[in-house]
């Protein structure tokens, strides 16, 4: 149950946020239990945990992953959890903090000395709300790559957006993930509807760049729902 989740040590002892949100240098953070979060222009102290529901890692922050907070807990209750630091246990790459990846069940550094050659990434994608994969199986993909300190350029294999250079994001391409350009004004974007989850996206687009949002193109308002074109537009 959620109460047991919120009262469990797994939740209470989560490390506090590592710092303010990207692009928001004014965001202050204190040690738990009093954590400051942005609230418009004001900062309010929240003395208890804020469960943030999710269906996939992309709904969480870069320093988080999406999972059930209790071991063997209700699979339907997934929330954003703090990423795991080096030498902590893991089951997949997204559980490890940026700069690390999951190898043999342990988060290890993905820097030049630790991470060369082949990596294996298990990508279990959920299509629609039933959390089944395209063919009902978890797809295991071997990605041949060389990971260095330099950020990935366009087309480079990645695990998360922080692996990619500025102006790029880590997006799905077939059954792997590569660095793709963040969308510019006027470019076609994918509108994720609240009902229906993220659908079948084997060629995932990046999100719209700073100051842009994915909105229906004005001259397409008359079109049917299914054919409506969304583009990145100024707020």
């Amino acid at each position: 149950t959620l109460n047991s989740v919120l009262n469990s040590n797994a939740i209470k002892n989560l490390p506090p946020p590592l710092g303010g949100a990207a692009g928001h240098p004014g965001s202050a953070v204190s040690a738990a239990p009093g954590i400051l979060y942005p609230g418009g222009n004001k900062y309010q102290t929240i003395d208890n945990y804020q469960p943030y529901p999710c269906a996939e890692d992309e709904e969480c922050g870069t320093d988080e992953y999406c999972a059930s907070p209790t071991r063997g807990g209700d699979a339907g209750v997934q929330i954003c959890l703090a990423c795991r630091k080096r030498r902590k246990r893991c089951m997949r790459h997204a559980m490890c903090c940026p700069g690390n990846y999951c190898k043999n069940g342990i988060c290890v550094s993905s820097d030049q000395n630790h991470f060369r050659g082949e990596i294996e990434e298990t990508i279990t994608e959920s299509f629609g709300n039933d959390h089944s994969t395209l063919d009902g199986y978890s797809r295991r993909t071997t990605l041949s790559s060389k990971m260095y300190h330099t950020k990935g350029q366009e087309g480079s294999v990645c695990l998360r957006s922080s692996d990619c250079a500025s102006g790029l994001c880590c997006a799905r391409h077939f059954w792997s993930k590569i660095c793709k350009p963040v969308l510019k004004e006027g470019q076609v974007c994918t509108k994720h509807r609240r009902k229906g989850s993220h659908g079948l996206e084997i060629f995932q687009r990046c999100y719209c760049g700073e100051g842009l949002s994915c909105r229906i193109q004005k001259d397409h308002h008359q079109a049917s729902n299914s054919s409506r074109l969304h583009t990145c537009q100024r707020h």
């Epitope: 928001h24 269906a55 709904e59 922050g61």
Partner: nanobody, 123 residues
């Protein structure tokens, strides 16, 4: 800037129902997680319910089966349907909008708050 305006609060008898609304502006609504929190007098603010952009819902045990969270993308509005209200549900109810997580460059997925609406359950 995110703006959240709650409405629908008021005085209701035990066993009654209320529907809270939260009109959001300044955010691409359909891609954001929306939530409701509450704060009773002299107590800490507590989580009530949330709905993610992928329609994943989450409820506090104390309201499960009585409260229902929903969102209407076309109206940029989140709702909290509260049935079988109890005196212990009396609190200021705050609408919360998720910051959008990594898609918006945030290291942590967290909420931004509205000003709140008072719900009083009393006979």
């Amino acid at each position: 800037e995110v703006q959240l305006v709650e409405s629908g609060g008021g005085l209701v008898q035990p066993g009654g129902s209320l529907r809270l609304s939260c009109a959001a502006s300044g955010i691409p609504f359909s891609t954001r997680t929306m939530g409701w929190f509450r704060q009773a007098p002299g107590k800490e603010r507590e989580f009530v319910a949330a709905i993610s952009s992928g329609a994943t819902t989450l409820y506090a045990d104390s309201v499960k089966g009585r409260f229902t969270i929903s969102a209407d993308n076309s109206k940029n509005t989140a709702y909290l349907q509260m049935n079988s209200l109890k005196p212990e549900d009396t609190a200021v109810y705050y609408c919360a909008a998720g910051n959008g997580g990594r898609a918006y460059g945030y290291s942590r997925a967290r909420y931004e708050w509205g000003q709140g609406t008072l719900v009083t359950v009393s006979s």
